[in-house]
Interface confidence: medium
């Protein structure tokens, strides 16, 4: 089941251009920006997604684009360089010819540079944490009931396995869940962590990245869970090279 | 008490369609994963699909090739499973089936049962 | 498309006695197998999950086994109650799968 064949959409991806020109007059998707085929049954990368999200009309975005200097997460919005399978190449670079190194992710791993700037290996971000604060409520959650729910929505909304959400911590109102996967336990077919914290993020921002879906409505034993802050933490594999100058 | 209840079978014609209910009672079918499960006669069990009403996801076997589609009213309690292009291979008896509420898929809680005959 | 397969398709047992259901996934599907019990006319039910975890309401004469690829259903002290069809079914995945059962043991008490 690549892509609904009804009426030839993707039902993972808004952000494809979709058409029955696959095999046997099979519904086949291409994501916008990069005209790769994606297939629907699963999540698109997070590479191909910011390319598709850079290509858009501009009036399409709602979010200004921070400036360069700015210290809050920019979104990870800019035009990433993606490898035939969709994830990002090792190394990243502007127009004005500025180059960095990111890590699996598409996140800046290194200082900045030139042309010359080598990235020999694409790092993976084998731990992501994810730090929510939800809207206040009548009382705290319960504890097993919000870890149940939570891997529930990873497994169903983004099929990302069990295995991969390591735990899901609770202190009110702050909810961190811990997403691990290894280059090892990742096995074909695997939805990658960092893929299911995109389309999670965007999700809990309002903006969600599946087709005709209405927006996430998360509940905890039919109390909704309103989300008011996120922060997204990655750990790599290989620690980020940075010089002491970004650190004082 | 939390229960299952399949209808909608019969007897169809070859290339016909039919539509199966599944009405769930006593729990929110919302949050739980429910599978179609098929049984022709004499033979063993054989999964059709899946959906997470919640999330509206739905999963099918590699053989289904479109041909059958799985739904839900939620407000209804109720999920469907449209069979069409219907051959003399898909007379069986159709279960729904509803997953543990936990992180895997095993399945604790089945309806009886709707017996679906294709014959001309 | 992980693949299960089970031994031996029928086995007949006394009454009293102790039989042994074999299942085996073409791939390692860790501890995620769940046996059922089926009876002519009647829908399956679930016997045990996780491999081994017996479900509610569950005669402790079953017991589960295994992880990865090989798995057991053993039933001892065998009652003429017992005489059903068994299927495991593995719980791990949903996705590109064909069928995530088994095909099924019968077991025939004398």
């Known amino acids: 089941h690549t892509a609904a064949q009804d009426n030839c959409t993707c039902p993972t991806n808004k952000m494809t251009v979709c058409s029955p020109d696959g095999p046997g007059g099979r519904c086949q998707c291409r994501a916008l920006g990069s005209g790769m085929a994606v297939d629907c049954s699963t999540l698109t990368s997070k590479c191909l997604l910011l390319k598709a999200r850079m290509s858009a009309p501009k009036n399409a975005r709602t979010l200004v684009r921070p400036s360069e200097h700015a210290l809050v997460d920019n979104d990870g919005l800019y035009d990433p360089d993606c490898d035939p399978e969709g994830r990002f190449k090792a190394r990243q670079c502007n127009q004005t010819s500025v180059c960095w190194c990111v890590n699996s992710v598409g996140v800046r791993r290194t200082d900045k540079g030139d042309l010359s700037l080598r990235c020999d290996e694409l790092v993976r971000t084998h731990h992501i944490l994810i730090d929510l604060r939800h809207r206040p409520t009548a009382g705290a959650f319960n504890h097993s009931d919000l870890d149940a729910e939570l891997r529930r929505l990873f497994r169903e909304r983004y099929r990302l396995h069990p295995k991969f959400v390591a735990a899901v911590h609770y202190e009110q109102p702050t909810i961190q869940i811990e997403l691990r996967q290894n280059t090892s336990q990742k096995a074909a077919g695997d939805v990658d962590i960092g893929d299911a914290a995109y389309y999670f993020e965007r999700d809990i921002k309002g903006e969600s990245l599946f087709q005709g879906r209405g927006g996430l409505d998360l509940r905890v034993r039919g109390e909704p869970l309103q989300v008011e802050r996120t922060l997204i933490y990655y750990l790599d594999e290989i620690p980020p090279k940075f010089s002491m100058k970004r650190l004082t | 008490q939390e229960q299952l209840k399949e209808s909608g079978g019969g007897l169809v014609q070859p290339g016909g369609s039919l539509t199966l209910s599944c009405k769930a009672s006593?729990?929110?079918?919302?949050?739980?994963?429910v599978s179609w499960v098929r049984q022709a006669p004499g033979k063993g069990l054989e999964w059709i699909g899946y959906?997470?009403?919640?999330?509206?996801?739905?999963y099918y076997a590699t053989w289904v090739n479109g041909r059958f589609t799985i739904s839900s009213h939620n407000a209804q309690n109720t999920l469907y499973l449209q069979l069409n292009t219907l051959t003399a291979a898909d007379t069986a008896t159709y279960f729904c089936?509803?997953?543990?509420?936990?992180?895997?898929?095993?399945?604790?809680?089945w309806g009886p049962g709707t017996l679906v005959t294709v014959s001309s | 498309d992980v693949v299960m397969t089970q031994t031996p398709a029928s086995v007949e047992v006394a009454v009293g006695g102790t039989v042994t259901i074999k299942c085996q996934a073409s791939?390692?599907?860790?501890?995620?197998l769940a046996w059922y019990q089926q009876k002519p006319g009647q829908p399956p039910r679930l016997l045990i999950y996780?491999?081994?975890k017996l479900a509610s309401g569950v005669s402790s004469r079953f017991s589960g086994g295994g992880y990865g690829t090989d798995f057991t259903l053993t039933i001892s002290g065998v009652e003429c109650a017992d005489a059903a069809t068994y299927y495991c079914?593995?719980?791990?995945?949903?996705?590109?799968?064909?069928?995530?059962f088994g095909g099924g043991g019968e077991v025939v008490v004398k």
């Open positions: 089936a509803r997953d543990a509420g936990s992180t895997d898929y095993n399945l604790n809680l």
């Open positions: 996780e491999a081994s």
């Open positions: 079914h593995q719980a791990l995945t949903i996705g590109n799968v064909d069928n995530p």
């Open positions: 791939e390692d599907i860790e501890s995620y």
């Open positions: 006593g729990f929110d079918f919302n949050y739980y994963g």
């Open positions: 959906i997470y009403p919640a999330y509206h996801n739905t």
